[in-house]
């Protein structure tokens, strides 16, 4: 039985040209995390495999950095980066857990005055 839950940063906003940390945390399970996939809609951004390490998709190599931890840092944000992001935790023996984050990339002035939650 899958008892774990994924906590995420939820809905976040960031400035165009800036960077943001996408973070998920798996709790309430003793299952072993074997791999975490980060996806944007249907596009694979990165994989962190417990045995092999990080793989960053070639098309995102210049703008994506691993960490902190199992999280992902997106850099040089553009308005096109707005959308849903998913952290997919592959665990043993539980199976797969998925978390969702919605990122909105805003023009600088809008982001500065917006009331949305922002990762420092």
């Amino acid at each position: 039985m899958m008892t774990g839950t994924i906590e995420t940063t939820g809905n976040i906003s960031a400035e165009k040209g800036g960077s943001i940390i996408l973070q998920c945390h798996l709790s309430s399970t003793t299952a072993q995390v074997t791999q975490v996939n980060w996806e944007q809609q249907d596009q694979l951004l990165a994989i962190c495999n417990a045995d092999l390490g990080w793989h960053i998709s070639p098309s995102f190599k210049d703008r994506v950095a691993p960490g902190p931890g199992l999280g992902l840092t997106l850099q040089s944000l553009t308005v096109n980066d707005t959308g849903e992001y998913f952290c997919i935790y592959h665990t043993y023996p539980d199976g797969t857990y998925t978390g969702r984050i919605f990122l909105e990339v805003l023009e600088s002035s809008v982001a500065e005055h917006g009331a949305r939650f922002q990762i420092p």
Epitope: N49, D51, L52, H55, I56, G67
Partner: antibody, heavy 119, light 107 residues
Framework: EVQLVESGGGLVQPGRSLRLSCAAS????????MHWVRQAPGKGLEWVSG????????GYADSVKGRFTISRDNAKNSLYLQMNSLRAEDTALYYC????????????WGQGTMVTVSS | DIQLTQSPSSVSASVGDRVTITCRAS??????LAWYQQKPGKAPKLLIY???SLQSGVPSRFSGSGSGTDFTLTISSLQPEDFATYYC?????????FGGGTKVEIK
């Protein structure tokens, strides 16, 4: 005794194929990721490929991507490296190796099998 | 890919000397760094993993330190059996990569 024994090396012409095998004993093979590392004569070490315990994730060096395929058969305690479209620069001693659990440091190595690509 | 730059490429030392080898990564690799010793005609031997953890059976005169991009392997008092080539290896990013090696020779 924990042991890895490679086989399948030899002299092969450029463009041809070769399949290396690595027989494991003395540990629970199916619990570990496994790797291939090579060393050209008189040169340093080069990581070639790695595969997770269940073959769910695989990685390759850029120099072999698209030409080499790593695989394993846990029932036979064996690791394989299928090498296609071989080039002179693939000439090397090929080692298979197992990692320390959760560390990614390679603590057990075979004796190596020599692959020579030449016409 | 991550480049690992080892220095020096070779070092001449005497028995009893303290020897320090450095390994610099082109990007941060946390603590996912290992050190190996290789003697001619032999397979590499793991000395240090996780940047600073001593592999079982390895003498305590070997030690590793560092995180991020800068790492060090230290042999506190060189012994005759320590004359060999030493390699660092990162396992944070795929593909894994090795440094170019440091040859420790007898002075």
């Amino acid at each position: 005794e924990v042991q890895l024994v490679e086989s399948g090396g030899g002299l092969v012409q450029p463009g041809r194929s070769l399949r290396l095998s690595c027989a494991a004993s003395g540990f629970t093979f199916g619990d570990y990721a496994m790797h291939w590392v090579r060393q050209a004569p008189g040169k340093g070490l080069e990581w070639v490929s790695g595969i997770t315990w269940n073959s769910g994730s695989i990685g390759y060096a850029d120099s072999v991507k698209g030409r080499f395929t790593i695989s394993r058969d846990n029932a036979k305690n064996s690791l394989y490296l299928q090498m296609n479209s071989l080039r002179a620069e693939d000439t090397a001693l090929y080692y298979c190796a197992k990692p320390v659990p959760k560390s990614r440091g390679l603590d057990v190595w075979g004796q190596g099998t020599m692959v020579t690509v030449s016409s | 890919d991550i480049q690992l730059t080892q220095s020096p490429s070779s070092v001449s030392a005497s028995v009893g000397d303290r020897v320090t080898i450095t390994c610099r990564a082109s990007q941060g690799i946390s603590s996912w760094l290992a050190w190996y010793q290789q003697k001619p005609g032999k397979a590499p031997k793991l000395l240090i993993y996780g940047a600073s953890s001593l592999q079982s059976g390895v003498p305590s005169r070997f030690s590793g330190s560092g995180s991020g991009t800068d790492f060090t392997l230290t042999i506190s008092s060189l012994q005759p059996e320590d004359f060999a080539t030493y390699y660092c290896q990162q396992a944070f990013y795929l593909p894994w990569t090795f440094g170019g090696g440091t040859k420790v020779e007898i002075k």
